[in-house]
Amino acid sequence: QRLPRMQEDSPLGGGSSGEDDPLGEEDLPSEEDSPREEDPPGEEDLPGEEDLPGEEDLPEVKPKSEEEGSLKLEDLPTVEAPGDPQEPQNNAHRDKEGDDQSHWRYGGDPPWPRVSPACAGRFQSPVDIRPQLAAFCPALRPLELLGFQLPPLPELRLRNNGHSVQLTLPPGLEMALGPGREYALQLHLHWGAAGRPGSEHTVEGHRFPAEIHVVHLSTAFARVDEALGRPGGLAVLAAFLEEGPEENSAYEQLLSRLEEIAEEGSETQVPGLDISALLPSDFSRYFQYEGSLTTPPCAQGVIWTVFNQTVMLSAKQLHTLSDTLWGPGDSRLQLNFRATQPLNGRVIEASFPAGVDSSPRAAEPVQLNSCLAAGD
């Protein structure tokens, strides 16, 4: 059955479309079957994720003392007011360049496991989400985002890193995820090409036009390199981007600046904005599972939270996203998504009863998974 396209107000597992035709081949991207230069490789080629390159090139992010109350960046010049460390503008979580793990690309060589062995791991991301098989977990409470509203100054760094567009986030953005807290480090996007969708996660095989990832570091860890590969060390908030009738004003603040960073490696400064406005408004309905970064180093132990609600962008905005930036070797930066990876027994949890009357196959007997989390 064809999964209905998600609307901003309709859940991933929304009601049956009523259609009876099987999910046509044209609804599935072909990149997994016929790898081409610009297409994401399959399991053996494995590309991946964020501008979190190799461990030594990850930003050293240390929480400040309780008294100072935000993040301290070890490798940056700091301004000392009388006895008071200041946060240098535009430099938070600045990544360094030039490690082995920066030499990877979507499609072709080198195979990702050669770049980072973790890319051949058993619990990788992205995955295909099947709402009907998700385990309803009432313990998954609505997400809380704190400090995501930023004034226009200081400005933030927006960068074309050759495999995505990344907005570096300043200290102080926190997400409450269950009992723990996470610091937001950066956000970036994945997209397709003209007429071709490019989300990383899929829903019952359906790929969406694009996907936003907000990468977080658990407050249990002082630095990203300490958190890599540790369960819950990193957490990523993900949301699907869809085509809608109106321009999305929050996204336009970033998309309107892409021409300035068309060239690989270029960057610009953009006014601070309400980061939460880039995400869906319903923080209570989401899917969650443990996976990995979707680019080298493909480190596992990453907690993925995928919103049920989508974000709507205009057709023009989606075109701007997929048709403006350039990547390595004079190639367009397009189709920057990794093929979905096998669950290998993992259970995707849902914060809402996604499996109830949510699938076109609801009439068939289905084995529902049970929630693994205990307590409230």
Epitope: V79, Q86, G147, L153, P154, E155, P170, G172, Q269
Partner: antibody, heavy 119, light 112 residues
Framework: QVQLVQSGGGVVQPGGSLRLSCAAS????????MSWVRQAPGKGLEWVSA????????YYADSVKGRFTISRDNSKNTLYLQMNSLRAEDTAVYYC????????????WGQGTMVTVSS | QSVLTQPPSVSGAPGQRVTISCTGS?????????VHWYQHLPGTAPKLLIY???NRPSGVPDRFSGSKSGTSASLAITGLQAEDETDYFC???????????FGGGTKVTVLG
Amino acid sequence: QVQLVQSGGGVVQPGGSLRLSCAASGFPFSSYAMSWVRQAPGKGLEWVSAISANGGTTYYADSVKGRFTISRDNSKNTLYLQMNSLRAEDTAVYYCANNGNYRGAFDIWGQGTMVTVSS
Amino acid sequence: QSVLTQPPSVSGAPGQRVTISCTGSSSNIGAGYDVHWYQHLPGTAPKLLIYGNSNRPSGVPDRFSGSKSGTSASLAITGLQAEDETDYFCQSYDSSLSAWVFGGGTKVTVLG
């Protein structure tokens, strides 16, 4: 030592002009957004204008829009406020301040300079 | 009329606890923008006391604390001392005005 040293205040007639300066030292001035904030006699603090680190973006309070111009010279580590068409209600102590804190706070302040608009 | 509303004055005896409220709206504090507090002795530069709702810059005594809830915030001073007698201002950002905004200021008086 981190400091902002201001100059340029004085007495000016209504309709006149004045230029305030704010010299920064002890920190990488070109990496920081900056603002001007004022306090009229017996009143509270009022934000006047702000400028991004590279000078490419400027912001103004409605009360001064079209009359005041904020600018900076990063090679001289100096912030400026050009005030034209001054009015009596612009009389205040003007402070330059560092917008260095991502949460929107003003971390470092100048000592203030008095601007009096009077005939 | 200031965008953020503070009481004009509060007072307390030495050693007591006083709180200063700062009330905003859905376009500033209520929108999620942080609240910051400044201590301002007239004739001198304001000093950042609390940033990001509840964080103290180093050098600020832990007698000062801040909190935020909904559309309002508050500054608490415990163990009030004579040198705390001065003006205090709250500040945030307002998305409707596209401006950084301040409260009208509160004069703290230490009695006795």
